[in-house]
């Protein structure tokens, strides 16, 4: 044996953004040879493992929230760990509103900014584009939950959606957003590339999107303080549907 | 409560051979990771060998490795260590320790110790 | 040679507050894995004090502390007592062959 095995994958199904109460399972794919695997929590102060390649939650709750990474040994010899997973439970806090300004249907070459507002004093905003398979590149500046598009293309087209949370409790994150349908107008675009179908929020956790743009905002209001105990974060907590005062 | 009792140390020879067993009681022995580790006179602790809870996950120090095999019998609460071709630096206590467990996830750390089994590897 | 590295010896009057270090690396405690502390007794086995970094097990006085930052922790512990003199372990866990660790232990000495 000369050096590590090489490291395994470790894959969500369907998705890594799991709403509360939804399954998902956790998979180590390594090679066909692979003896045996080990998967593990990786919290500070509650590192855990289980000798399994897989994991399946059956009904997603707030303390299964976190990173996750894997290895798995051949004839004794251990591999490379996993690059890390992170498992982000949706639907904690209530929808963050996404709105385009100055409109959502732009014509090409403007500027328009998508702008998340939560309820609540976080932190953290990010905005996810259907579909895409890459990360859009960062703006050089933030504007608190602003995501400034600067020259609109044709491709920028598409349904987008936003959600916040507390950089305190980085893996617990609100419910999505509203689709946000934004349409380029004008003799660049196309039809394929106007949606012609809002798809239902109920199938957020079997589509994989891809991060666009993460926001993390400066202000002078002091940002909420989340504790997060085995029982679930403290204050605010809740599904979708439940509201609260803004924080102080 | 929690009880581990090892037995099976004693005088052997520059290359001989020993068996160590741990009789666990008072928790569910087949639930948990069982590992051994090792004290010589005066110095420090030394982690020997582990095994997961239903006996298929088996790790080894690489100053054991090839000498010494770990076991366990869950029907009979028991672990094991058989440790062959011993050498003087193997002189030892021998403690058996059990690792923490939470619903279905181990923990990296040892919650309780039995009061360990003197291995004496001299000519 | 131990993988993590402790303070062979430590003391301190009755009353006053000692600290051990433990120091890893990347592939222990930077690598995320936690850092537990053991307390040896005299001609006893040794028994846990702290896990997780810095829970203590019930039975355990609130006078022992531990943090961890980076690739090293520490315990602390406040108002010393004769009865706290003991060796003292840290140990963790290597992700390269998935190995317990310990450190070589520190000897606590209560003056006086």
């Known amino acids: 044996q000369h050096g590590p095995l090489p490291k395994p994958s470790l894959q969500a199904q369907p998705s890594s953004l799991v709403p509360l109460g939804h399954p998902v399972t956790l998979r180590c794919l390594g090679p066909s040879d692979a003896d045996l695997y080990r998967l593990e929590k990786v919290k500070p102060g509650k590192l855990i493992f289980i000798d399994q390649d897989f994991l399946f939650i059956p009904i997603m709750e707030i303390n299964n929230a976190g990173r996750y990474r894997c290895s798995y040994q051949n004839e004794s010899h251990w591999s490379l760990p996993s690059d890390q997973l992170e498992l982000i439970a949706t639907g904690v806090y209530s929808k963050p509103s996404l709105s385009a300004h100055p409109s959502s249907a732009i014509p090409p070459g403007r500027d328009v900014t998508l702008k998340c507002q939560s309820q609540y004093s976080f932190d953290e905003f990010v905005l996810y584009k259907e579909g895409d398979t890459r990360p859009y590149k960062r703006p050089e500046k933030w504007y608190r939950a602003n995501f400034p598009v600067i020259t609109v293309t044709a491709a920028h087209s598409g349904t987008y959606r936003c959600y916040s949370f507390s950089s305190s409790s980085p893996y617990l994150w609100s419910a999505p957003s509203d689709p946000l349908v934004v349409v380029v107008t004008g003799p660049s675009a196309t039809p394929s590339q106007v949606p012609t179908e809002v798809p239902s929020p109920m199938t957020e956790a079997s589509r994989r999107p891809s991060m666009l743009l993460t926001n993390k905002i400066s202000t002078t209001e002091k940002p909420m303080n989340i504790t997060v105990s085995p029982e679930g974060p403290s204050p605010p907590f809740g599904f979708a549907h439940q509201h609260y005062a803004k924080g102080n | 409560q929690v009880q581990l009792v090892e037995s099976g140390g004693g005088l052997v020879k520059p290359g001989g051979s020993l068996r160590l067993s741990c009789a666990a009681s008072?928790?569910?022995?087949?639930?948990?990771?069982m590992s051994w580790i090792r004290q010589a006179p005066g110095k420090g602790l030394e982690w020997v060998s582990s095994?997961?809870?239903?006996?298929?996950?088996?790790d080894y120090a690489a100053s054991v490795k090839g000498r010494f095999t770990i076991s366990r019998d869950n029907a009979k609460n028991s672990l094991y260590l058989q440790m062959n071709s011993l050498r003087a630096e193997d002189t030892a206590v021998y403690y058996c320790?059990?690792?923490?467990?939470?619903?279905?996830?181990?923990?990296?750390?040892?919650?309780?110790w039995g009061q360990g089994t003197l291995v004496t590897v001299s000519s | 040679q131990s993988v993590l590295t402790q303070p062979p010896s430590v003391s301190g009057a009755p009353g006053q507050r000692v600290t051990i270090s433990c120091t890893g690396s990347?592939?222990?405690?930077?690598?995320?894995?936690?850092v537990h502390w053991y307390q040896q007794l005299p001609g006893t086995a040794p028994k846990l004090l702290i896990y997780?970094?810095?829970n203590r097990p019930s039975g355990v006085p609130d006078r022992f502390s531990g943090s961890k930052s980076g690739t090293s922790a520490s315990l602390a512990i406040t108002g010393l007592q004769a009865e706290d003199e003991a060796d003292y372990y840290c140990?963790?866990?290597?992700?390269?062959?998935?190995?317990?660790?310990f450190g070589g232990g520190t000897k606590l000495t209560v003056l006086g």
């Open positions: 320790a059990r690792h923490y467990r939470e619903f279905r996830w181990h923990y990296y750390y040892f919650d309780y």
């Open positions: 008072g928790f569910s022995f087949s639930d948990h990771y």
């Open positions: 095994v997961g809870s239903e006996g298929k996950f088996i």
């Open positions: 990347s592939s222990n405690i930077g690598a995320g894995y936690d």
């Open positions: 997780g970094n810095s």
């Open positions: 140990q963790s866990h290597d992700l390269g062959a998935h190995v317990w660790v």
